[in-house]
Interface confidence: low
């Protein structure tokens, strides 16, 4: 557990004062409809927001929106619906948002049926001005900025074609037709599959895969037979058909598709899917769907190149494509993540790991906790946390996991104490050293959000009644006070506050009810007087990432390094500040053999860290020898896990083994494989 | 026995470099880590850095970071220390210490620290104009 | 980097007498600490490791206690060749930093 002072709990001073004096009120002229709001750009204080009412009509449905604009994180807000020349905006295309610092805004518009194009109006300067354009395409996605150039935007129209503009918008031409889907690549380089035949649906699993590097005059043809395609960090995914039957198999490029091999992982069938859960530039997790309607399946975990992959867990819970899944990247500390499991009996469970998907683990069993009934012995069970898949199926679950990048080991979570998951109404539990231990925070279900990296812990009840209090904790969830914001409750939406968590300003949004109208409202509640000095040198801590053995010499060590961190004092109430940089400092640690993966025709024997070389290559693997590259077969039976930067000690170097030899298949020559370039 | 047998005395001009040795006997070699001591007249003792026999691997003090070099030749079990820049206030006994943190073969283990237990008779190295 | 802070600088004692020598560590150092023993001309000495294990061949004079971050030598009755200097040590965490040390002399 990260430091931390047993203390009895103190009150923050004058709290009630404070924040009286610093909680904004306002109060939309709104029929209650929807409310979608948006950040624009990084510490500008800007807000979008967005009310839309719809009114059904006997042959159409005639909608209403406004859009307002706040530059002081929503203590004041100014209806600025007139620079969109009152037009109502389209929210299932959301308000895009520029990358970065850019200020730029695309705002959607519904059009009426018979005109030639849609409508969008675009913004350079968070939103203070709107130029209306009238587009030669009615849009199918909303617009995607190149993350590279703002100005450049990418859309796909509802007649399949592909539209760039270079321009932010003004000007749009077609680059393509037939275009199923599209996406930024890095550099300003678009990918997309195209069809040939019928339709995206009819072709699938004969799509093939372009890209252009100069926005659409020139073009290469890099993959067909293609199925669907993927980025994640610096991996190109394409699954490809296989020639013989309907079985396909994910292939893998690290250079932009010039060239691929073929991924190590099992090929799936029609009704079965494979799905990247997190990628970086070091590596990836993938699922492959077990066949059959099973709701589960494998997560791999691959090497460097994307292309030896690691059986990391069983089990994994996620059901059909594009549905639900646990799986959960602990931004808080590197290297842990948060998954489900389905078990034998159908229950399920969450497991965590603290390596990158090396080992996984039940969570310990909070402290401050018993073990429900799910638990067959009383005294042993573990935490388990409710996330996408409980939302989905509607559990008394608000809120999925929460951490943030610059509240180093903190996670907030929903869960049960047990020995699966519970359909009983949840805690909330906090853990303040990225998973390892937990405590419980809050009794019943909550919305919660993280302020001032750390230093602040806002949560609300969740409630089917009105609501007029809201919690706060100012020692990582320790100790809380509670505030009453308003004298009349209101029907409570949701908790706002900038991304990143930097800033000390929540909002909460509502509506009020009475007999004839209900207004949106929200109350925007500044922290800044409650942590009222800045931090200072001795608010802060050594904390030691990842120790689970102060005594062990290699105590800490993740992935080849360990880190410590400065970590603010639970009994310092002090602003980090939006300017605060998160201090850690690495130490490289000595190799052991845990820090290196099997090579492919490797394995590790059950409780041996040894690498030891398969006595032949079976299956799927021979496809790889067949398709697989020179280089790729040529190994030492290990790898250094992708991203550990460990150095000396154990150094397992031994002869070089050409796996070629082994490669014996009457499988078709790889002269077969299909490919074209323009 | 267990003993670490260092270099003679060495006398240095300003700017030069010094490498002094280090030979062990008396245990394997490979089972322990090798840390560096240094003493200035009249002072107290500061730890210059570490390496691992297996890997050659190392890890210096902050304050020696680009001026150090630990090396180590497992065929003769000697490790070497090479300081280089030299000035004045380099002047001192410069020590070899066998220290006890095992390699990590696999996971985490609980090993209590057990102090640099075996030291050689140290080396005095002068640097003057 | 952890700092190791040694008191007293100087601690006088007459032979026989009980001596005790203090060292603080910045951050908790757990129980990774050993204490030496250096005699003018010669290389440091083991006497304690994990901060209270005597090292082989010290005698049951020596003794050691403390966690986290505050330690103790105690020298229970002092023998006239345990005028010295000595030096506690972490290895909690890299770099490894020596207290300033405690000359111990005849009173």
């Known amino acids: 557990s990260a430091p931390g002072e047993d203390e009895e709990c103190g009150r923050v001073r004058d709290f009630v004062a404070k924040l009286a004096n610093n909680t904004h009120q306002h109060v939309f002229d709104d029929l209650r409809g929807s409310v979608s709001l948006s950040w624009v750009g990084d510490s500008t204080g800007v807000i979008l927001v967005l009310t839309t009412f719809h009114v059904p009509l006997v042959i159409m449905t005639f909608g209403q929106s406004k859009l307002y604009r706040s530059e002081d994180y929503g203590k004041n807000f100014k209806d600025i619906t007139d620079l969109i020349n009152n037009t109502f905006i389209r929210t299932e295309f959301g308000m895009a948002i520029g990358p970065e610092n850019s200020g730029k805004v695309v705002l959607t518009a519904e059009v009426s049926g018979g005109s030639r194009g849609g409508r969008i109006f675009r913004s350079s300067d968070f939103a203070k001005n709107f130029v209306q354009t009238d587009l030669p395409f009615h849009p199918l996605t909303q617009m995607m900025y190149s993350p590279q150039n703002s100005d450049y935007l990418l859309a796909l129209s509802t007649e399949n074609g592909l539209w760039v503009s270079k321009n932010f918008g003004g000007k749009w031409e077609e680059i393509h037709k037939a275009v199923c889907l599209a996406k930024w690549g890095s550099d300003n380089t678009i990918f997309f599959t195209t069809y040939a035949n019928g339709s995206c649906k009819a072709d699938l699993g004969a799509l093939e895969l372009w890209r252009t590097s100069d926005l659409g005059k020139s073009f290469k043809t890099i993959g067909v037979k293609i199925y669907s395609f993927g980025l994640g960090g610096r991996f190109l995914f394409a699954s490809v058909m296989a020639d013989k039957d309907t079985t396909r198999r994910i292939h893998v490029s690290t250079d932009q598709g010039d060239t691929w091999s073929m991924a190590q992982l099992p090929s799936v069938g029609q009704e079965q899917f494979y799905s990247i859960l997190a990628a970086n530039d070091d590596m990836v997790f993938m699922h492959v769907d077990e066949p059959g309607d099973t709701g589960f399946g494998t997560i791999f975990t691959s090497d460097d190149r994307g292309i030896v992959y690691s059986k990391s867990l069983d089990r994994h819970l996620y059901t059909t494509t594009g549905g639900e899944t646990d799986f959960t990247n602990v931004t808080s500390l590197r290297g842990v993540y948060i998954t489900s499991v389905l078990s034998e009996d159908n229950s399920i469970q969450t497991m965590i790991t603290f390596d990158q998907g090396g080992r996984w683990t039940h969570l310990r069993k909070p402290e401050n906790s018993e073990c429900d009934a799910t638990a067959k012995n009383k005294n042993e069970c573990s935490l388990h946390i409710h996330a996408s898949y409980s939302i989905s199926q509607k559990l008394n679950v608000p809120m999925a996991p929460l951490s943030e990048p610059n509240a180093v080991g903190i996670v907030i979570a929903h869960g049960s104490v047990g020995d699966a998951i519970s359909v009983m109404v949840p805690d909330v539990y906090i853990s303040d050293d990225g998973g390892y231990s937990w405590t419980k925070m809050l009794e019943g279900p909550h919305y919660y959000t993280i302020l001032d990296s750390g230093g602040i812990i806002v949560a609300i009840e969740h409630s089917s009644r009105p609501i007029n209090v809201i919690k706060f904790s100012t020692d990582e969830g320790q100790c809380w006070q509670t505030y009453t914001f308003t004298r009349d409750p209101i029907y409570f939406t949701g908790l706002a506050s900038e991304p990143g968590a930097r800033s000390m300003n929540i909002s909460i949004w509502g509506f009020t009810e009475s007999f004839l109208t209900s207004q949106w409202v929200s109350y925007t509640i500044d922290f800044k007087d409650i942590l009222e000095r800045n931090c200072e040198e001795k608010d802060y801590t050594i904390w030691l990432a990842h120790s689970t053995d102060p005594e062990d010499y290699e105590d800490g060590c993740i992935l080849g390094y360990k880190e410590q961190f400065l970590r603010l004092r639970k009994s310092s109430v002090c602003q980090n500040g939006r300017d605060y940089v998160v201090t850690k400092q690495p130490s490289i640690c000595l190799c052991s053999l845990e820090d290196f993966l099997c090579d492919f025709g490797y394995y590790r024997p059950e409780n041996d860290s040894k690498c030891v070389e398969q006595p032949e290559l079976k299956g799927h693997d021979l496809e790889f020898c067949l398709y697989g590259r020179e280089e790729h077969l040529t190994t030492n039976g290990y790898r250094k896990i992708p991203g550990d930067k460990c150095q000396g000690g154990v150094n397992p170097v031994r002869e070089v083994k050409d796996l070629k030899k082994k490669c014996t298949s009457n499988f078709l020559s790889p002269e077969k494989q299909n490919s074209k370039s323009n | 026995q267990v003993q670490l047998v260092q270099s003679g005395a060495e006398v240095k001009k300003p700017g030069a470099s010094v490498k002094v040795s280090c030979k062990a006997s008396g245990y394997t070699f490979t089972s322990r880590y090798m840390s560096w001591v240094r003493q200035a007249p009249g002072q107290g003792l500061e730890w210059m850095g570490i390496?691992?026999?297996?890997?050659?691997?190392?890890s210096y003090a902050q304050k020696f970071q680009g001026r150090v070099t630990m090396t180590r030749d497992t065929s003769t079990s000697t490790v070497y220390m090479e300081l280089s820049s030299l000035r004045s206030e380099d002047t001192a006994v410069y020590y070899c210490?066998?220290?006890?943190?095992?390699?990590?073969?696999?996971?985490?283990?609980?090993?209590?620290?057990?102090?640099?237990?075996?030291w050689g008779q140290g080396t005095t190295v002068t640097v003057s104009s | 980097e952890i700092v190791m802070t040694q008191s007293p600088a100087t601690l006088s004692v007459s032979p026989g007498e009980r001596a005790t020598l203090s060292c603080r560590a910045s951050?908790?150092?757990?129980?990774?600490l050993a204490w030496y023993q250096q005699k003018p001309g010669q290389a440091p000495r083991l006497l304690i490791y994990g901060a209270s294990t005597r090292a082989t061949g010290i005698p049951a004079r020596f003794s050691g206690s403390g966690s986290g971050t505050e330690f103790t030598l105690t020298i229970s009755s002092l023998q006239s060749e345990d005028f010295a200097v000595y030096y506690c040590?972490?290895?909690?965490?890299?770099?490894?930093?020596f207290g300033g040390g405690t000359k111990v002399e005849i009173k």
């Open positions: 390496i691992n026999p297996v890997g050659g691997s190392t």
């Open positions: 951050q908790s150092v757990s129980s990774n």
């Open positions: 210490a066998r220290d006890p943190s095992g390699i990590a073969l696999a996971g985490p283990a609980s090993r209590p620290y057990y102090g640099m237990d075996v």
């Open positions: 040590q972490q290895a909690r965490l890299g770099p490894w930093t």
